[in-house]
Amino acid sequence: SLAADTPTACCFSYTSRQIPQNFIADYFETSSQCSKPGVIFLTKRSRQVCADPSEEWVQKYVSDLELSA
């Protein structure tokens, strides 16, 4: 579910609120060249939201995007 044309982007801060799962369309991971690890969620309204990959909800959403039927 990871876009082939992944943008080069970094997260400098993370969202402080959990996004409703049904708002999420896709995600990509930030580059190792970034100063901090990050996940960027793409919403169904084409917004990009930086999230902290150490948060459980972020991990669950990412996992569900790819492995849940």
């Epitope: 930030t30 190792s32 690890p37 990959p53 459980e56 991990q59 669950k60 990412v62």
Partner: nanobody, 113 residues
């Protein structure tokens, strides 16, 4: 710097078992979504299983009931127990941590009689 070292692969007969290990440094595996991928010759890399920091696990349909992902926090290591192996499980297996685009060298699993 994040480093992931996979091991435990080998040649096994159909129906056999293997346990793969992913030893991590530069990252605390218990804090991140840890994932096992595999890549067969001429195929794209595919996600096999993952485990969240809270211990929730997910599997691709073709390995459900046969593979089990787990983690040893004290050893900072993630495992993939593979049972009832099939020829179609033949691939190089890699582990990865969500948010870190670092890959190890992988470990080869060959299922053949």
């Amino acid at each position: 710097e994040v480093q992931l070292v996979e091991s435990g692969g080998g040649l096994v007969q159909p129906g056999g078992s293997l346990r793969l290990s992913c030893a991590a440094s530069g990252i605390i595996t218990s804090r991140y979504l840890m994932r096992w991928y595999r890549q067969a010759p001429g195929e794209q890399r595919e996600l096999v299983a993952d485990i969240t920091s809270g211990g929730s696990t997910n599997y691709r349909d073709s390995v459900k009931g046969r593979f089990t992902i787990s983690r040893d926090n004290a050893k900072n290591t993630v495992y993939l127990q593979m049972n009832s192996l099939k020829p179609e499980d033949t691939a190089v297996y890699y582990c990865k941590a969500l948010g870190f685009d670092r890959w190890g060298q992988g470990t080869q699993v060959t299922v053949s009689s």
